[in-house]
Interface confidence: medium
């Protein structure tokens, strides 16, 4: 249904080996990054914190899909993870490697 | 070509009458809102200020399009416009009506 397909956070596990980042990230081997999936149809729900521009774009798209594309479901808040990584051949601890995991999605 | 279809700001003129906002916005009759269109393919260009999460998502999508959706081309910086609007029947001037026009697009 349309509601089930609405913009929301969904699981996305990242395996660093799969993306070739295991060459410099020692640990963890992967992490739950999540992703934002689904549609941003008008009217845009409040919890998706739409900007005025997104509201207008969604409204224009509703009236004329040729004129404007839909607003897009994207991460609006990201969180850090802790990693061990190689820096000049030395294992280094980064307590907050920012912008790695989605905590909130919204329509933009 | 792929480069021409890459994430960028494109014109989108908003006519307030078309979206029914002329009932409360007195002036202007419309404005250039712009929109963000195009693809966010890996590698993501620096001027699109991708988050680490967007880079990872684009990379996963490149390797397995079933596993993750593409990163999305969205407004990353919005600007205000000035409007005259009706507030309880009184015409009011708003010098900065925030979040109305796209000034920058990026991959998120």
């Amino acid at each position: 249904n349309a509601k089930g397909n609405y913009c929301k956070r969904t699981p996305l596990y990242i395996d660093f080996k799969e993306i070739g980042w295991d060459s410099w990230i020692i640990a963890p081997p992967g992490y739950e990054a999540y992703e934002c999936r689904g549609v941003c149809n008008y009217p845009l729900a409040e919890h998706l914190t739409p900007t005025k521009h997104a509201i207008i774009q969604a409204l224009v798209h509703l009236k004329n899909s040729q004129k404007a594309s839909k607003a897009c479901c994207v991460p609006t808040k990201l969180e850090p993870i802790s990693i061990l990584y190689l820096d000049k051949g030395v294992v280094t601890y980064k307590f907050k490697y920012e912008g790695m995991a989605v905590s909130e999605c919204g329509c933009r | 070509n792929a480069k021409g279809n890459y994430c960028k700001r494109t014109p989108l003129y908003i006519d307030f009458k078309e979206i029914g906002w002329d009932s409360w916005i007195i002036a202007p009759p419309g404005y250039e809102a712009y929109e963000c269109r195009g693809v966010c393919n890996y590698p993501l260009a620096e001027h699109l200020t991708p988050t680490k999460h967007a880079i990872i998502q684009a990379l996963v999508h490149l390797k397995n399009s079933q596993k993750a959706s593409k990163a999305c081309c969205v407004p990353t910086k919005l600007e205000p416009i000035s409007i005259l609007y009706l507030d309880k029947g009184v015409v009011t001037y708003k010098f900065k009506y925030e979040g109305m026009a796209v000034s920058e697009c990026g991959c998120r």
């Epitope: 963890p28 081997p29 802790s82 061990l84 051949g89 030395v90 | -």
Partner: antibody
Framework: QVQLQESGPDLVQPSQTLDITCTVS????????VHWVRQPPGKGLEWMGT???????DYNSAFKDRLAISRDTSKNEVFLKMDSLQTDDTAVYFC?????????WGQGILVTVSS | QFVLIQSDSMSTSAGSTVKLSCKRS????????VYWYQQHEGRSPTTMIY?????PDGVPDRFSGSIDSSSNSAFLTINDVQIEDEAVYFC??????????FGGGTKLTVL
Amino acid sequence: QVQLQESGPDLVQPSQTLDITCTVSGFSLTTYNVHWVRQPPGKGLEWMGTMWNGGGIDYNSAFKDRLAISRDTSKNEVFLKMDSLQTDDTAVYFCARLGYYVDYWGQGILVTVSS
Amino acid sequence: QFVLIQSDSMSTSAGSTVKLSCKRSTGNIGSSYVYWYQQHEGRSPTTMIYDGDKRPDGVPDRFSGSIDSSSNSAFLTINDVQIEDEAVYFCQSFSSGIKFIFGGGTKLTVL
């Protein structure tokens, strides 16, 4: 050359506090990381915690709130402080340098907890 | 939280090949790097294998590391075992939250 040397008491009374210093030479504590690892007599190795080069500290949750690791970069020293010692804390306490891998260890200090 | 399970002891004869195992109790053994340490009686440990299969300078190529997904185990293989290889061998890996986990150690006796 690279060296790590543990110093501290040989004997600690039960319920007392253990203070060990790891004095390093031949490298900088702002470049390399230092682990604390202990080994009870005839038993295996147990990771206690790590002093990271950037100043962050990680602890083994098994030691709950009784363990504190710190450093003085100007003196090239890393400190281990553990409260409320019991007889089963009797062990050889090692400090070790973590580069890409653990490449240098101290010789260890045997600490006996006994009254 | 997983544990790394090693057999307490193993015996082998000089010149033979021995394979020491390190089984991860839960989770995938291949999901984190495995390290191997050698410790002679009364001495500090030394790293024999890091990142699963890399050898530090000075470690003989008789020592090699591998993993086997089917048994969820890591292995340290020593070819052409020498008398000086008699020691306790510990495996180590990372748990989530970047904590360092050691196995209980295997005492290798060379006959």
